[in-house]
């Protein structure tokens, strides 16, 4: 093949070497960058800054060297359009440091640095923990901080992400109310920090005040669904990002629902309660307390992780016609208190058939909320007996 | 123990070039930084540049850009500061010192070079 | 480059005085540097990384402070502790120095 003339040439069939001494001095406008997955670049003394723009049209690059060349500043968000990229190499350039940001979101798998004149500070944090880690090939490049000694030996018993501190109110909050979140922010080289109120919805209208290093955050109008969600503050510097959640407990009364009884592997009579705070259960059996034992006990199913509203079963363990009756869910909390009712019958009582009548041999549940409702009989050709123990 | 000592005064002309050595001894030479910093007569301490004696890397501060090469001799243990174009806002003591890494701050100086640029 | 202030620039005090000098930095920096100079001498190194004494160092001296407001406490001001102080930053490139705290005698 003849020389390639240009500044950047084909290499293989995704790739392009950029190596013509001072030839470039951004990537803008790189031929066939749609499909590129790797980009070899060499000696550009005039490449001193990479940022969003230059990267842009470049989804499939894997492999990026930008080596030998004058690159001082790499912006945080300048690999934000290559979210595959899985090799980085800017060995032997003029950066001093490299934001953490810069990194995260990528999945590198080698990450070369050596030959810059990094300066060790709290922003280099994070390689120094992936050299400690063993992380993207970083330990056995030794890296040096210019002027002082090993990125290994940088002491960092200052380099923390901030500390975040969310004050939420003590007092009960009714549904209506206003609340005020104010969220404060502690450490070094405070960056950017913030709310992140993607559950919230509907939930409460959303007004934002202050800054760093105090951000406050009033939810007026505050309605049930607020409950359980969660109300995330967050903060970044240099060294990386804090998020702190909360919840608002928003008070409301109990409610309660039941449903119709189903067979299972036990039995189980479905119900709903819902209430904050979350409301204290009782059942009636036909009026009366029902105590529960190991034949007849209440379940809950694994709560959702963002709503109040609890499921579960009262979980009868093979009833029989004694359990058949009037089952009522009593739900309290300080704010109000509900109840619900449900008829199951499970098993038609063995001693009130006629001798003449057919044998009934299998029954479908009726479960109402009336007291009426006859078993469904199944008439056999061939007649048997049928004994029942009563428990 | 870890000494460094620098060579004797020197009174230059304006225009003209200085080199100051400073001798190091009690540690592994090739291993820490070496800064150089300087001090105008009743004024306080600025930076000049550091080299690193295992591979000659060095930079130095903006101010000194295209006057000042750090050089080191690895094996006589010596590094060097020229400042060339000598003017008389020059004159000062330099001093060299070590960049301590294990502790991570200037452990031990020079005892200083007085440097006068006069006419 | 970060600028460092000290406060005050000089001072007259007594032996057996508690001296305190301040250095604050232009932006926040991770650890601070003290360092104490004689006529005619080098400087010497008194606190490294803010609150750490330095070998031969004695306990009347100490450091404290973070992001950009520093301390240097001399507990009880000793004969030899007649000196000027400064202090410095290399959390970002290039280090630098403050202008210097001149403790003088009353």
């Known amino acids: 093949a003849a020389p390639c003339p240009d500044a950047c040439c084909p290499h293989g069939s995704s790739g392009l070497r950029c190596t013509r001494d001072g030839a470039l001095d951004s990537l803008h406008h790189l031929p066939g960058a749609e499909n590129l997955t790797e980009l070899y670049i060499e000696n550009q003394q005039h490449l001193q800054h990479l940022e969003l723009r230059d990267l842009r049209g470049l989804g499939e690059l894997r492999n990026l060297t930008i080596v030998k060349s004058g690159l001082r500043f790499v912006a945080p968000d300048a690999f934000h359009f290559t979210p595959r990229l899985s090799r980085l190499n800017l060995s032997f350039n003029a950066l001093e440091s490299l934001s953490w940001k810069t990194v995260q979101g990528l999945s590198l798998q080698e990450l070369v640095l050596s030959g810059n004149p990094l300066h060790c500070s709290c922003a280099l944090r994070w390689l120094q923990r992936w050299e400690e880690e063993g992380l993207g090939g970083v330990p056995e490049q030794k890296l040096q901080c210019h002027g002082q000694g090993p990125l290994a030996h940088m002491p960092n018993a200052s380099c923390g992400v901030p500390t975040l501190k969310v004050q939420v109110p003590n007092a009960s909050v009714d549904v209506g109310d206003d609340v005020l979140l104010r969220c404060q922010v502690e450490g070094r080289g405070l960056e950017q920090a913030g709310w992140i109120l993607t559950e919230l919805e509907q939930s409460a209208t959303v007004m934002k005040s202050g800054g760093l290093p105090s951000l406050g955050l009033t939810l007026a109008n505050v309605t049930s669904d607020l409950n359980r969600k969660n109300v995330t503050c967050w903060a970044e510097n240099d060294v990386g990002r804090a998020e702190v959640s909360v919840q608002v407990n928003v008070s409301f009364p109990a409610s309660v629902q039941l449903h119709t009884a189903v067979e299972m592997h036990h039995w189980c009579i479905p119900f709903s309660v819902d209430g904050q705070p979350a409301p204290s259960l009782r059942w009636l059996f036909n009026g009366s307390v029902l105590n529960e034992t190991s034949f007849i006990f209440t379940e809950f199913l694994e709560p959702a992780a963002n709503e109040t509203v609890r499921h579960g079963c009262l979980r009868l363990n093979q009833p029989t016609h004694v359990n058949n009756g009037n089952y009522t869910l009593l739900a309290a909390n300080p704010f109000g208190q509900a109840s619900a009712s449900i008829m199951a019958a499970f098993m038609d009582n063995p001693f009130e058939f006629n001798p003449e009548d057919p044998i009934p041999v299998s029954f479908s549940p009726v479960d109402t909320n009336s007291t009426s409702g006859d078993p469904v009989e199944k008439k056999d050709e061939t007649p048997f007996g049928v004994s029942v123990a009563v428990g | 123990q870890v000494q460094l000592v620098q060579s004797g005064a020197e009174v230059k002309k304006p225009g003209a070039s200085v080199k100051v050595s400073c001798k190091a001894s009690?540690?592994?030479?090739?291993?820490?930084?070496m800064h150089w910093v300087r001090q105008a007569p009743g004024q306080g301490l600025e930076w000049i540049g550091t080299?690193?004696?295992?591979?000659?890397?060095?930079s130095n501060a903006q101010k000194f850009q295209g006057r000042v090469t750090l050089t080191r001799d690895t094996s006589t243990s010596t590094a060097y500061m020229e400042l060339s174009s000598l003017r008389s806002e020059d004159t000062a003591v330099y001093y060299c010192?070590?960049?301590?890494?294990?502790?991570?701050?200037?452990?031990?100086w020079g005892q200083g070079t007085t440097v006068t640029v006069s006419s | 480059d970060i600028q460092m202030t000290q406060s005050p620039s000089s001072l007259s005090a007594s032996v057996g005085d508690r001296v305190t000098i301040t250095c604050r930095a232009s932006s926040s920096v991770s650890y601070l540097y003290w360092f104490q100079q004689k006529p005619g001498k080098a400087p010497k190194p008194l606190i490294y990384?803010?609150?750490n004494l330095a070998s031969g160092v004695p306990s009347r001296f100490s450091g404290s402070g973070s992001g950009t407001d520093y301390t240097l406490t001399i507990s009880s001001l000793q004969p030899e502790d007649f000196a000027t102080y400064y202090c410095?930053?290399?959390?970002?490139?290039?280090?630098?120095f403050g202008g210097g705290t001149k403790v003088e005698i009353k």
């Open positions: 010192t070590r960049f301590y890494y294990e502790d991570w701050y200037f452990d031990v």
């Open positions: 080299i690193y004696p295992g591979n000659s890397d060095s």
């Open positions: 410095q930053q290399y959390h970002s490139y290039p280090p630098t």
């Open positions: 009690g540690y592994t030479f090739t291993t820490y930084w």
């Open positions: 990384r803010t609150s």
